[in-house]
């Protein structure tokens, strides 16, 4: 079948924009670290890169293949306020490269890390 | 309390980067429209803007206040393959402005639409 060049171009553009790669996302600090419900952070979120996007096949998942760690300083507030907001420096995982992996590859990668 | 200017600057930067605003995201076409399980799209995802980011209070949600619609052409594949991939043009919601709304404001907005 022959398809209009414009259609093919726009589809190719969509492929590129949605590919599996590190993307800037907002991470809820409290949820990321499962902190106590009486502890809050200001700002409540930080911006980091995490793998995201779509893979060509349903059996594949977009996963990080390398990670760096970013230190960010935030204000921590504990209720009831025994003291004012205190600056805390927290380290966040920042995905630097990604790959579409089969679900079994993901399983193997995860289990090889937790067995160490 | 007096805080280091660098700390305040980096925190302010984090606030700005994580604020509630339209963000480029990948949308799974099949999931967005709840299509039949034997229908696939190539690419499976499209890139659109959706509201995202964090609000200053737990009682608030980042919601769209205005939306445009983008038409995108994709290949639709139906299994079993009675014919080759056919180009289809689909309209996707693209959030153009956002606001942090209380959960009840979200309720009001949603329920006023479905009552029309």
């Amino acid at each position: 079948a022959h398809y209009n060049t414009e259609i093919l171009k726009s589809i190719d553009n969509e492929w590129r924009k949605t590919q599996c790669m590190p993307r800037e996302v907002c991470i809820d600090v409290g949820k990321e670290f499962g902190v106590a419900t009486n502890t809050f952070f200001k700002p409540p979120c930080v911006s980091v890169y995490r793998c995201g996007g779509c893979c060509n096949s349903e059996g594949l998942q977009c996963m990080n293949t390398s990670t760096s760690y970013l230190s960010k300083t935030l204000f921590e507030i504990t209720v009831p306020l025994s003291q004012g907001p205190k600056p805390v420096t927290i380290s966040f995982a920042n995905h630097t490269s990604c790959r579409c992996m089969s679900k079994l590859d993901v399983y193997r990668q995860v289990h090889s890390i937790i067995r160490r | 309390a007096h805080y280091n200017t660098e700390i305040l600057k980096s925190i302010d930067n984090e606030w700005r980067k994580t604020q509630c605003m339209p963000r480029e995201v990948c949308i799974d076409v099949g999931k967005e429209f709840g299509v039949a399980t034997n229908t696939f799209f190539k690419p499976p995802c499209v890139s659109v803007y959706r509201c995202g980011g964090c609000c200053n209070s737990e009682g608030l949600q980042c919601m769209n206040t205005s939306t445009s619609y983008l038409s995108k052409t994709l290949f639709e594949i139906t299994v079993p393959l009675s014919q080759g991939p056919k180009p289809v043009t689909i309209s996707f919601a693209n959030h153009t402005s956002c606001r942090c709304m209380s959960k009840l404001d979200v309720y009001r907005q949603v329920h006023s639409i479905i009552r029309r």
Epitope: - | V106, R108, H111
Partner: antibody, heavy 118, light 112 residues
Framework: QVQLVESGGGVVQPGRSLRLSCAAS????????MHWVRQAPGKGLEWVAI????????YYADSVKGRFTISRDNSKNTLYLQMSSLRAEDTAVYYC???????????WGQGTLVTVSS | DIVMTQTPLSLSVTPGQPASISCKSS???????????LYWYLQKPGQPPQLLIN???NRFSGVPDRFSGSGSGTDFTLKISRVEAEDVGVYYC?????????FGGGTKVEIK
């Protein structure tokens, strides 16, 4: 006309569970948010929970959070309140009420009495 | 949580005379959409509550015009221009600007 009929109330021991139902008729149930409101004997009104028209969002009063679950079945035009770990202070008449766009209530059922007692 | 304070606690009125109930909220009920989410309900003896007034001053369908609501921000009033025997019961104000929704403690109206 709008009708809401609660059922499922009764006497229950502390720590036990109970499920209340509210049968709705006279309006398109699937287009309305719904609430549960309660009233302890001789006391004022206390809002308990809200559920969105499609069941996608639910919010609760702190006094019942983690113990009560609001749900709905739009195919049966029925609202539910699953109550667990019941306490003496949950003794009340429980009303279901239809939500307005403003998130208040316009029509109420007659109520069903829940008594938590050993 | 927003605290709703109603006064008086009870009211004894002669038929045909006016009555007034006050409701004060601990914070403004004026929302960013320009609406004020304050409602009035009447609970007659042995019955469920019924909606009287929507968003401060709008009478709900079927509510007699002797009932009127007014106010703004944090101060609201329900007035009955001429009390009738059927108006007895407990009146409640409600805020729905934010969760949790909260009611006033109620004002009991009886006939002298």
């Amino acid at each position: 006309q709008v009708q809401l009929v609660e059922s499922g109330g009764g006497v229950v021991q502390p720590g036990r569970s109970l499920r209340l139902s509210c049968a709705a008729s006279g309006f398109t149930f699937s287009r309305y948010g719904m609430h549960w409101v309660r009233q302890a004997p001789g006391k004022g009104l206390e809002w308990v929970a809200i559920i969105w028209y499609d069941g996608s969002d639910k919010y609760y009063a702190d006094s019942v959070k983690g113990r009560f679950t609001i749900s709905r079945d739009n195919s049966k035009n029925t609202l539910y309140l699953q109550m667990s770990s019941l306490r003496a202070e949950d003794t009340a008449v429980y009303y279901c009420a239809r939500g307005t766009v403003g998130a208040s209530f316009d029509y109420w059922g007659q109520g069903t009495l829940v008594t938590v007692s050993s | 949580d927003i605290v709703m304070t109603q006064t008086p606690l009870s009211l004894s009125v002669t038929p045909g005379q006016p009555a007034s109930i006050s409701c004060k909220s601990s914070q403004s009920l004026l929302n960013s959409d320009g609406k004020t989410y304050l409602y009035w309900y009447l609970q007659k003896p042995g019955q469920p509550p019924q909606l009287l007034i929507n968003e401060v001053s709008n009478r709900f369908s079927g509510v007699p015009d002797r009932f009127s609501g007014s106010g703004s921000g944090t101060d609201f009033t329900l007035k009955i221009s001429r009390v009738e025997a059927e108006d007895v019961g407990v009146y409640y104000c409600l805020q729905s600007i934010q969760l949790p929704l909260t009611f006033g403690g109620g004002t009991k109206v009886e006939i002298k």
